[in-house]
């Protein structure tokens, strides 16, 4: 679960356990900091909470894929 | 294993303020990614959910509850709680917390403290 | 808010059978519905989550289905040790809701 260093950077030391429903979420932002033991993506949902996840599991990259997808701008 | 535990005082009167704390162990209260709930059950009734706190002090609250509810929380003593004011016999209720990673599924819950509200 | 109205509010059924509750909500909340277990003098215990998944350690004569407004919960093999009231709750919006709960007995 993300662990709040300081106020720009949270560490996940537990991941969520199961896949969240695509369409729940919102953006990600991946943690590199030299705080943090381990790398992590944490998701945002559409009810403003956060959730850590490994990104070494399929469907967080196929989530995080699908989610730049969505942020995108569309090229003229 | 994280666990929780309900405390406060199981008799209140009319118009004071109730105070309930929820000791978090097994873990840290302050890791992210956990969200701190209240939730009641009036008696013989269904489920009432009141609202939240997250480590970061962030909270939400029941907009039916929200004018006199005041969760917070303590990283230094692994707790938080929730403070209702001006209560009446309507409040009377077992008071749960329980906790949600974030998914917005309640999958740790204290054993409850009942709490009546009475002169 | 979204309103969560479960039926039956009571049942009672033999162990062995079949028994099925439903939850229907008052507007489109996709499949963002949990059920919880609660037997005399405990907390919840959820049961599934996202409307058809199975928690962790969880039997699996426990199962549920639905999508948008109807859902259904359903026990395959009724067992003494199921003897306890079941919720539905739902998150598509805060603050969340849950039914009124459907108290199961045994006959």
């Known amino acids: 679960q993300p662990v709040g260093i300081n106020t720009s950077t949270t560490c996940c030391y537990r991941f969520i356990n199961k896949k969240i429903p695509k369409q729940r979420l919102e953006s990600y932002r991946r943690t590199t900091s030299s705080h943090c033991p381990r790398e992590a993506v944490i998701f945002k949902t559409k009810l403003d909470k956060e959730i850590c996840a490994d990104p070494t599991q399929k469907w967080v990259q196929d989530f995080m894929k699908h989610l730049d997808k969505k942020t995108q701008t569309p090229k003229l | 294993q994280v666990q929780l535990q309900e405390s406060g005082p199981g008799l209140v009167k009319p118009s004071q303020t109730l105070s309930l704390t929820c000791t978090v162990s097994?873990?840290?209260?302050?890791?992210?990614?956990?969200?701190w709930n209240w939730i009641r059950q009036h008696p013989g009734k269904g489920l009432e959910w009141i609202g939240y706190i997250y480590y970061s002090g962030n909270t939400y609250y029941n907009p039916s509850l929200k004018s006199r509810i005041t969760i917070s929380i303590d990283t230094s003593k692994n707790q938080f709680s929730l403070t209702l004011s001006s209560v009446t016999a309507a409040d009377t209720a077992v008071y749960y917390c329980?906790?949600?990673?974030?998914?917005?599924?309640?999958?740790?819950w204290g054993q409850g403290t009942m709490v009546t509200v009475s002169s | 808010d979204i309103q969560m109205t479960q039926s039956p509010s009571s049942l009672s059924a033999s162990v062995g059978d079949r028994v099925t509750i439903t939850c229907q909500a008052s507007?489109?909340?996709?499949?963002?519905l949990n059920w919880y277990q609660q037997k005399p003098g405990k907390a919840p215990k959820l049961l599934i989550y996202d409307a058809s998944n199975l928690e962790t350690g969880v039997p699996s004569r426990f199962s549920g289905s639905g999508s948008g407004t109807d859902f259904t919960f359903t026990i395959n093999s009724l067992q003494p040790e199921d003897i306890a009231t079941y919720y539905c709750q739902e998150y598509n919006n805060l603050p969340y809701s849950f039914g009124q709960g459907t108290k199961l007995e045994i006959k």
């Open positions: 507007q489109d909340i996709s499949n963002y």
């Open positions: 097994g873990g840290s209260i302050s890791s992210g990614g956990n969200y």
């Open positions: 329980a906790r949600d990673g974030g998914d917005d599924a309640f999958d740790i």
